[in-house]
């Protein structure tokens, strides 16, 4: 039952990390334009992995895909490329889980086959986590380095009182998102793992032994016991349970306005 | 066709306050932002702020923050700007704008012209 | 607030002939989001609200004729008119559309002989 409800929530819990490593993965506000201490203008920017968008006071919104590879920053690929990896390394230990799972019954499988899935959704859940954890992260470290750089030289001269504005950007929604969703996949992963030792079945199996007493001759012969581990279920009497965790699927929603400050 | 109606005139008394009018038809009102311009005889355009219709987000130029409150009626699509301790200063033409994309006045009221005087 | 200065504050032609008139921001209207200048350009005629004539700096308003040009980026804005026409006579202002509280120039007059 234990090794069930593991199970069931470690999957639960990954497709919920998943299903946010793809929003985080496609939202538009990974960058926002930073409006702190900065003049207050009428226009806002922000950015995402896959294109750049501005929303005026007026209401209207103008985004612009990044229609080229070779011109965008090798660090903004980079992360494009570990998202990816990280939604298709779920998707795939989404798939192997479905299976893997204990409350789901195919054929004759054997609970050491289910184990083996299990450990391998596990890890491919801890593998996609990993890699959506490390692209947000790398992102944000972007950010920060482009931040500091742009303080630095936030205004710049030009022929006396004539300044530019340099626009700044901070962390958007995106990167909370990818970050809680990561941890989420990765904790799924894990716990795929931890309710992987609960299925294996060890099998020891004990050899008779004769045992010989004075006076009479008696053989005891265990019959060959099944040692189980950790979270150790009946292996001759399963239970199935049928009617898998639902989930809600995330929302992405979107505010219709900034506020300017 | 995109109209924005004001009432021509308006006299008041020194130290009282006043509400102007800007009725809005042609378009969907809570679409757009309603902006005040005010602009005194033989001077230039002064932005006084501007309202979402929406949820009534007003964004407010420093100089006219305890002077002007903008307010909008969704159910007549009317944007309403009241003017509060009056002096001759304020006597101008208050102008109604829609804000359009690009931030600019597409379409403009015939102005409303406040005369402040005892 | 951003300080709009235009010049000249007012010139005098004949019609046919070709005007620009100057605008100058004390900041960039230039946004690098989407690279548009949010600087527009209004034309008040007597007795009249203005009208809009170009946004974005260089996008002319439907309905305007198309010897209005508007050109410039970051801090410098240029409107020419290529061909002055007698119902030309009005007060041109430029407008910062970019920072809040948004600000307008004070206007060149346009004369006709």
């Known amino acids: 039952m234990a090794v069930t409800a593991c199970q069931g929530l470690g999957f639960v819990v990954s497709l919920i990390g998943i299903a946010g490593i793809i929003a985080a993965t496609c939202m538009d506000q990974w960058s926002t334009q930073d409006l702190y201490n900065n003049p207050v203008t009428a226009v806002f920017n922000y950015q995402g992995l896959w294109r750049s968008c501005v929303r005026e006071s007026s209401g209207f919104t103008e985004c612009r895909g990044y229609f080229t590879l070779l011109g965008l920053p090798a660090m903004l690929q980079a992360v494009r490329a570990l998202m990816i990896v990280g939604i298709v390394l779920g998707a795939i230990g989404l798939l192997v889980s479905i299976f893997a799972l204990k409350c789901i019954r195919i054929g004759s499988m054997e609970d050491s086959a289910k184990a083996n899935m299990t450990l391998t959704s596990g890890i491919m859940f801890i593998v996609s986590g990993l890699c959506a954890i490390a692209g947000v992260s790398v992102f944000a470290n972007m950010l920060v380095t482009n931040f500091w750089m742009s303080t630095a030289n936030m205004y710049t001269g030009m022929g006396g009182m004539v300044q530019t504005v340099q626009t700044r950007y901070t962390f958007g929604a995106a990167l909370f998102v990818g970050w809680v969703a990561g941890g989420l996949t990765l904790i799924g992963g894990v716990m795929m793992c931890i309710a992987c030792r609960g299925l294996a079945p060890e099998e020891t199996n004990y050899k008779a032994v004769s045992y010989h007493a004075s006076g009479h001759s008696v053989a005891y012969k265990p019959g060959g016991f099944k040692a189980s581990t950790g979270f150790g279920s009946n292996t001759k009497n399963k239970k199935i349970y049928d009617g898998g965790a639902r989930t809600e699927d995330e929302v992405q929603s979107y505010p219709s306005k900034h506020d300017y400050v | 066709q995109v109209q924005l109606q004001q009432p021509g005139a308006e006299l008041v008394k020194p130290g009282a306050s006043v509400k102007l009018s800007c009725k809005a038809s042609?378009?969907?009102?809570?679409?757009?932002?309603m902006n005040w311009v005010k602009q005194r005889p033989g001077q230039g355009l002064e932005w006084i702020g501007n309202?979402?219709?929406?949820?009534?987000?007003?964004h407010y130029n420093q100089k006219f923050k305890d002077k002007a409150t903008l307010t909008v009626d969704k159910s007549s699509s009317t944007a309403y700007m009241q003017l509060s301790s009056l002096t001759s200063e304020d006597s101008a033409v208050f102008y109604c704008?829609?804000?359009?994309?690009?931030?600019?006045?597409?379409?403009w009221g015939q102005g409303t012209t406040l005369t402040v005087s005892s | 607030d951003i300080v709009m200065t235009q010049s000249p504050s007012s010139l005098t032609v004949t019609a046919g002939e070709k005007v620009t008139m100057s605008c100058k921001s004390s900041?960039?209207?230039?946004?690098?989001?989407?690279?548009?200048?949010?600087l527009t350009w209004y034309q008040q005629k007597p007795g009249q609200p203005p009208k809009l004539l170009i946004y974005?700096?260089?996008t002319r308003e439907s309905g305007v004729p198309d010897r209005f040009t508007g050109s410039g980026s970051g801090t410098d804005f240029t409107l020419t008119i290529s061909s002055v026409q007698a119902e030309d006579l009005a007060v041109f202002y430029c407008?910062?559309?970019?920072?809040?509280?948004?600000?307008f120039g004070s206007g060149t007059k346009l004369e006709i002989k």
């Open positions: 704008a829609r804000l359009n994309y690009g931030n600019c006045f597409d379409y």
């Open positions: 309202i979402d219709p929406s949820d009534s987000e007003t």
């Open positions: 900041q960039t209207l230039l946004n690098s989001g989407n690279q548009k200048n949010y």
């Open positions: 974005w700096a260089s």
């Open positions: 042609g378009y969907t009102f809570t679409r757009y932002r």
């Open positions: 407008q910062n559309d970019y920072f809040y509280p948004f600000t």
